[in-house]
């Protein structure tokens, strides 16, 4: 095999046998029973145990539930391609009893000129080509079919769309004599939707377009277009919604300005400005109309595009997102943090919080991290005592109960969850930080000291003594 390696870290079991079950007749009520959490507010653990027990007892009745894997389908329309001209595709795990469809857009930065696309092709080829994709993928986090890992939508039809267009899911240009690479991210989404209509999506009640990182930005750029596409194809009853994870970036001033040389040091505005031209990028029509020609790059930034969107979108964003810090040239390596940098980081959290002020459905923990929804432990983080799956459930209910336009939250079911504490990991449910050298878990106080945050400085604005603050943090309060 010429010494070629495939991405072995992904499970590569052989694909499951082809399915032969008959599809449900059109119009047949096939939605699984809705879960109403109101009666179990105080006893979620017991409720989840019952759900798990019920699910497991039903497993034998449902052959496709036995296999956790999503299976690869390369697009039949082979003119819709990855960067290198190989066909794009998607991984699918059907759930015949459900009319919910989750389409997940993978992330993985981007490239914006010939040079950095060439080097990306030589080092991260699976993000530019389908040639070595494994035949199956395991669904994790929100893509898991296990109710304990995915209490939100475990029974949905799961679709994972690999990112192989390097264009933040915005491109609409094919490979040609002139173009060494194709950039067809926006077209890939459209074609996947078209193909899925023939695989059961036509009977869907809800299509949730989700994504992480560049995929999260891809959600903001494409959700209205998907809704429009389905309307035009004669499926106006399918409710299209968006879930954008770690794709809500700020076009803020970098901590240290650097020239636009490579993907991760180039200021995001400049990278996108260059990228849009290189990719022939498309942005949502209503947003495009708000900016002059040549200024379409603005629509890649959540707080600018969001107000123009028609579809409901739930925004998930760490207040101290690692990708945001990277493009801002903030690199935390365990060395003490100087005051200027500490203030910069705290201000970033403040700015991000401000941009989410008018986003009714949002979940923004004060953590230093990146991406969450396809992590296995995505259920662990809480904001104001509410987990993300729970917030998403509340969002579903608010939309179901026609609260879309209302800012009044359902009683005991919040959807606007933004941390207000002002420094990284001040939320004790943040993902665990480990000292990379010792492997030891660090509590919040240790982490802050490790980062060089002076406890006196952190405690003062809270009106606390350092010892009181340390006690609170150590106790996880």
């Amino acid at each position: 095999s010429e010494g070629r390696k495939t991405w072995r870290r992904r499970g590569q079991q052989p694909p499951p046998p082809p399915r032969t079950e008959a599809a449900p007749a059109a119009g047949q009520p096939v939605e699984s029973f809705p879960l109403d959490f109101t009666a179990v507010e105080g006893n979620m653990d017991s409720f989840m145990a019952q759900v798990k027990s019920l699910a497991q007892s039903l497993y034998p009745c449902s052959a496709q539930q036995l296999n956790e894997d999503l299976r690869l389908h390369l697009l039949l329309n082979t003119s819709v391609t990855c960067n290198d001209g190989s066909p794009a595709g998607y991984y699918l795990k059907e759930s015949r009893g459900s009319r919910r469809w989750l389409l997940f857009l993978e992330g993985g930065w981007y490239c914006f000129n010939r040079e950095n696309c060439d080097s990306r092709y030589d080092t991260m080829r699976r993000l530019m080509s389908s040639r070595d994709w494994p035949r199956t993928r395991t669904g994790t986090g929100i893509l898991s079919s296990q109710p304990e890992e995915n209490p939100y939508w475990w029974n949905a039809n799961m679709v994972f769309i690999p990112y192989c267009s390097s264009d933040v899911w915005s491109g609409a240009s094919s490979k040609s004599e002139k173009n060494e690479y194709a950039f067809m991210g926006a077209l890939i989404i459209q074609e996947v939707v078209r193909e899925l209509l023939g695989r059961g999506l036509s009977g869907a009640k809800v299509l949730l377009l989700a994504g992480s990182s560049a995929g999260g930005t891809g959600v903001l750029l494409n959700v209205d277009r998907v809704a429009e596409q389905l309307e035009k194809l004669g499926y106006p009853a399918i409710q299209v919604r968006g879930l954008a994870d770690s794709g809500w970036f700020l076009d803020n001033k970098q901590y240290r300005h650097t020239d636009c040389v490579d993907t991760i040091t180039c200021a995001p505005t400049e990278a996108i400005r260059r990228g849009i031209r290189y990719w022939n990028g498309v942005v949502p029509e209503r947003c495009r109309r708000q900016f002059q020609e040549g200024e379409e790059w603005n629509c890649f930034f959540g707080y600018k595009v969001y107000p123009t969107l028609r579809c409901p979108v739930f925004v998930v964003q760490w207040l101290f997102d690692e990708a945001q810090l990277t493009v801002d040239n903030v690199h935390l390596t365990g060395q003490p943090v100087q005051e200027g940098l500490r203030l910069y980081i705290q201000n970033l959290g403040r700015e991000l919080r401000h941009t989410l002020k008018d986003v009714p459905a949002s979940f923004a923990p004060a953590c230093l991290s990146h991406e969450i929804i396809i992590r296995s432990h995505w259920t662990d983080v809480q904001v104001k005592g509410t987990s993300l799956p729970r917030a998403l459930h509340c969002w579903d209910r608010s939309l179901h109960d026609s609260h879309k336009a209302s800012k009044t939250p359902l009683k005991g079911c919040p959807v606007h969850l933004v941390d207000s504490c002002p420094w990284p990991h001040c939320n004790p449910s943040c993902p665990t930080v480990r000292d990379q050298f010792t492997g030891q878990e660090m509590n919040v106080a240790q982490f802050l000291m490790h980062m060089g945050f002076d406890m006196q400085t952190v405690a003062q604005p809270q009106g606390l003594e350092p010892s009181e603050l340390l006690g609170m943090l150590s106790n996880g309060s």
């Epitope: 390696k5 993985g108 030589d122 991260m124 080829r125 070595d132 991760i264």
Partner: antibody, heavy 119, light 111 residues
């Protein structure tokens, strides 16, 4: 099996030139980015230069920029490094290495060729 | 450029004992679920040999006493039970962006 063989090293005076070659076999050469890496006597590894799989993009370490030129001939399965204006600090063993495209790690190295710059 | 710093510069460990080498990047070398950090072993008079790629994946043919861990900026190479043939210089290397860079190397000896 996968093999890389460097040649062209030797003794040269400061200011002189040399051209190193790397012959590849056992794999589809045009599929892989290729690199030159050097190691001064008793010192660590230093990345020198990269040529993309198609040969359309090249990169250099600052220490050799403007003096060294990397090129490749995919039809001949060969990688080259033209070294001009050589300095004493360019004295090293020069390795060509293949970068795996699922991560950019060097999964195959040549045995190296020695370049000595001395008057 | 991303600067890679290894520690310690040299290390002496008894046969059968655990050896740990650290590598720190000046900025994150992780993206999209992968960490673009790799480890090589070099013995005198030989070219380097790949041990671990993408932070934790063992190259085929490499004994499983070698393991790698870490993400973001901090990474570790561990040899669980040192053997005589493990005496060598070990290098970390990142391929997150060009220019690629190496750590300065860690010389591992037997105590």
């Amino acid at each position: 099996q996968v093999q890389l063989v460097e040649s062209g090293g030797g003794l040269v005076k400061p200011g002189g030139s040399l051209r190193l070659s790397c012959a590849a076999s056992g794999f589809t050469f045009s599929d892989f980015g290729m690199h030159w890496i050097r190691q001064a006597p008793g010192k660590g590894l230093e990345w020198v230069s990269y040529s993309s799989s198609g040969g359309t993009t090249v990169y250099y370490a600052d220490s050799v920029k403007g003096r060294f030129t990397i090129s490749r001939d995919n039809a001949k399965n060969s990688l080259y490094l033209q070294m001009n204006s050589l300095r004493a600090e360019d004295t090293a063993v020069y390795y060509c290495a293949r970068a795996s495209y699922d991560g950019g790690y060097f999964d195959c190295w040549g045995q190296g060729t020695t370049v000595t710059v001395s008057s | 450029d991303i600067v890679m710093t290894q520690s310690p510069d040299s290390l002496a460990v008894s046969l059968g004992e655990r050896a740990t080498i650290n590598c720190r990047a000046s900025k994150s070398v992780s993206t999209s679920g992968y960490s673009y950090i790799h480890w090589y072993q070099q013995k005198p008079g030989q070219p380097p040999k790949l041990l671990i790629y993408l932070a934790s994946d063992l190259e085929s043919g490499v004994p499983d006493r070698f393991s790698g861990s870490g993400s973001g900026t901090d990474f570790t190479l561990t040899i669980s039970s040192l053997q005589a043939e493990d005496v060598a210089v070990y290098y970390c290397h990142h391929s997150r962006e060009l220019p690629f860079t190496f750590g300065q190397g860690t010389k591992l000896e037997i105590k």
